[in-house]
């Protein structure tokens, strides 16, 4: 029917030619100068989240798109004006010629043109939508860029402060080292002086020894006389002692035993007559070093030395190896008695360990180990347990065989991770194991689904953080 042929004329305008009978109609339409097709590589539909475009590039593209939009709008307006002008001219011609046949053709052509215009408008709307889509995407990209920039800035600031801290620490350590070197030099000098003094002393002593040897010869002569006198004296002393003991027992048959001043554990405190709960000063075995411990003189016959207590979260248990070694906290509240003391004590004789637990629902349970001891510090205070009984689970929540003790600065667990840093607190971690009574203290209603809480798996499961715990020891023969 109507054969539309599209071609380009010399001035770059689109030319629509319509052949109808003997008449030929040519319409010259203005061209869209800057409009690119959506398939152009210039516009990307994919938002590249992993490798964002450069900021300047994005701005440039945005400007290009804005120009295209403006040109399209202008072109549309030109097209409308052009069609209206042409229509007017054609209508005047048709009226003048008054050829009815041609009028019909013109109306048909007009309709076609209008359809074409509508089609162009639709295409432009699509282009406009695409442009808007692109703009939105670019805005998103820009937002992502600014966010990642902020993130990077924060990271840089954090790293800078970390570097500053390390530098401070470094300079502090350097000063310390220098001070130690100075001290070392002074000590060396004093040692040298002492050595010289000792040499003088040795030579003096040699001469004194010579004199003494001479005197010994003389003394040997008098020795036999002295021996006799000594024998006589001993006899007299024995007689006096016998007389004294006889007279004392006659006067007072209940001679008061001198009260023991130093105690190794709460069992000794209890046996000395102190049967009230409270804090007592204990002494390290074979030493004068003291430690304060809470003694439970009521539970299960008394004499229990409390080595750990958690009850209210008032003490931070994320402590260093040294602090776990010597003990920390408040003996009348939350505290850790100290690995060194417990190790020395439990290697002197056989001890039992009782672990008393409370949950947030008012329930209580315990685990009792009939034999407990800790290895020395050289063996990382490894825990040794035998013979479990009690109500806090049939299986031991302290992994068997016993593990080494680990802290935030002393990683001795069986995990590639650092259990103490991850779960907080010092404990005999496995990898990381079913218990940690030194974990984070969580209050009620915040104590479930907590991987780093106060855990005793075979009683309350893995995510439950307990309300209170007490670890206590007592000699097995108490």
């Amino acid at each position: 029917y109507n054969n539309f042929r599209k071609s380009m004329d010399s001035i770059g305008k689109k030319q629509y030619q319509v052949q109808h009978g003997s008449c030929s109609y040519t319409f010259l339409l203005p061209e869209m100068d800057n409009c690119r097709s959506s398939s152009s590589p210039y516009v990307s539909n994919a938002v590249q989240r992993d490798a964002p475009l450069e900021y300047d590039d994005s701005v440039q593209r945005l400007q290009v798109l804005e120009n295209i939009m403006e040109n399209n709008t202008q072109w549309l307006m030109k097209l409308e004006n052009y069609i209206q002008d042409n229509m007017k001219k054609e209508m005047v011609e048709i009226q003048q010629n008054a050829v009815q046949n041609q009028t019909a053709v013109m109306i048909e052509i007009g309709t076609n043109l209008l359809n074409q215009t509508a089609e162009q408008t639709r295409k432009l709307t699509d282009v406009e939508a695409q442009v808007l889509n692109q703009t939105t995407r670019l805005e998103l990209q820009l937002l992502e860029h600014s966010l990642s920039t902020n993130k990077l800035e924060k990271q840089i600031l954090d790293q800078t402060s970390e570097i500053n801290k390390l530098q401070d620490k470094n300079s502090f350590l350097e000063k310390k080292v220098l001070a130690m070197e100075d001290k070392h030099i002074i000590q060396l000098q004093s040692i040298k002086e002492e050595k010289d003094q000792l040499q003088v002393l040795v030579s003096k002593q040699n001469s004194i020894i010579e004199e003494l040897e001479k005197k010994i010869v003389t003394a040997t002569v008098n020795n036999s006389v002295l021996q006799k006198q000594q024998h006589d004296l001993m006899e007299t002393v024995n007689n006096l002692l016998t007389m004294m003991s006889t007279s004392n027992s006659a006067k007072d048959p209940t001679v008061a035993k001198e009260e023991q001043i130093s105690f190794r554990d709460c069992a000794e405190v209890f046996k000395s007559g102190h049967t009230t709960n409270g804090i007592y000063t204990l002494t390290f075995p074979n030493s004068t070093e003291e430690i304060k411990a809470y003694c439970d003189m009521e539970a299960g016959g008394g004499g229990w030395t409390i080595i750990q207590r958690r009850e209210d979260g008032s003490v931070d248990f994320q402590r260093t190896w040294k602090e776990y070694k010597v003990g920390f906290g408040n003996p009348s509240g939350e505290y850790w008695l100290g690995n060194e003391f417990v190790s020395q004590l439990t290697n002197q004789q056989r001890y039992v360990l009782k672990i008393h637990l409370k949950d947030w629902e008012g329930n209580e349970a315990y685990s009792l180990y009939e034999h407990f001891y800790l290895s020395s510090e050289e063996l990382n205070y490894r825990i040794h347990l035998k013979g479990l009984t009690g109500t806090a689970g049939k299986i031991s929540s302290i992994s068997q065989p016993g593990n080494d003790f680990s802290t935030k600065d002393g990683d001795n667990d069986k995990c590639i991770c650092k259990c103490s840093q991850m779960l907080t607190g010092g404990w005999w971690f496995d990898a990381c194991g079913p218990s940690n009574l030194n974990g984070m203290y969580y209050p009620q209603r915040q104590n479930t689904n907590k991987f780093n809480g106060i855990k005793w798996y075979y009683w309350k499961g893995s995510g439950y953080s307990l309300k209170a715990t007490t670890m206590m020891i007592r000699p097995a023969d108490f």
Epitope: I279, E290, D312, G327, N330
Partner: antibody, heavy 121, light 108 residues
């Protein structure tokens, strides 16, 4: 028998300095933290400063921060309080008191008899 | 800073009577960080109670402590002549350590 004996008190003019000492005996001095606590005439007790057993950590009341310095010499079993830029309100009896054992938290269980510091022009 | 307020300021009682001294804290803290001291004129303070309720070595059982959170109490069940003195509550958990203003227990 735990004993704490303070010395170094006396009359001093405002702005001047004074150094108090506290000689300790009857316990392992190097294992215990030590406090200075003061009491103005007719008034209540006011905590001044605390030093840890090894001297690594020191704490001060806001009223003396920047002016007073606590220190110790474990080889001599002695605690010190260096008081600079003294003010009239620093007039008090200064007590030396035994504090916590190593990292344990513990109230002052043994006190000295105190030394009087009078700041007056 | 934890501020400790003691009441009453002065308590006038006769020997044999019961004394109840109050100590209120400006914010809640663990009772294991509360202590009570007794001070007589011209003498150094003496530790009576630690951990809010534990008697120190050598302290008679007529002295007892209780309380938690922000409200603490020292009770002397039957006053003896030697008990007339000033009593201080003391918080030793965090720096700065603080003392209450004191309660004077005097003979009526």
């Amino acid at each position: 028998q735990v004993q704490l004996v303070e010395s170094g008190g006396g009359v001093v003019q405002p702005g001047r300095s004074l150094r108090l000492s506290c000689a300790a005996s009857g316990f392992t001095f190097s294992s215990y933290g030590m406090h200075w606590v003061r009491q103005a005439p007719g008034k209540g007790l006011e905590w001044v400063s605390l030093i840890w057993y090894a001297g690594s950590n020191k704490y001060y009341a806001d009223s003396v921060k920047g002016r007073f310095t606590i220190s110790r010499d474990n080889s001599k079993n002695t605690l010190y309080l260096q008081m600079n830029s003294l003010r009239a309100e620093d007039t008090a009896v200064y007590y030396c008191a035994r504090g916590p054992l190593r990292y344990f938290d513990w109230p002052s269980d043994y006190w000295g008899q105190g030394t009087l510091v009078t700041v007056s022009s | 800073e934890i501020v400790l307020t003691q009441s009453p300021g002065t308590l006038s009682l006769s020997p044999g009577e019961r004394a109840t001294l109050s100590c209120r804290a400006s914010q809640s803290f663990s009772s294991s960080y509360l202590a009570w001291f007794q001070q007589k004129p011209g003498q150094a303070p003496r530790l009576l109670i630690y951990g809010a309720s534990n008697r120190a070595t050598g302290i008679p059982d007529r002295f007892s402590g209780s309380g938690s959170g922000t409200d603490f109490t020292l009770t002397i069940s039957r006053l003896e002549p030697e008990d007339f003195a000033v009593y201080y509550c003391h918080h030793f958990g965090t720096s700065p350590l603080t003392f209450g203003g004191g309660t004077k227990v005097e003979i009526k």
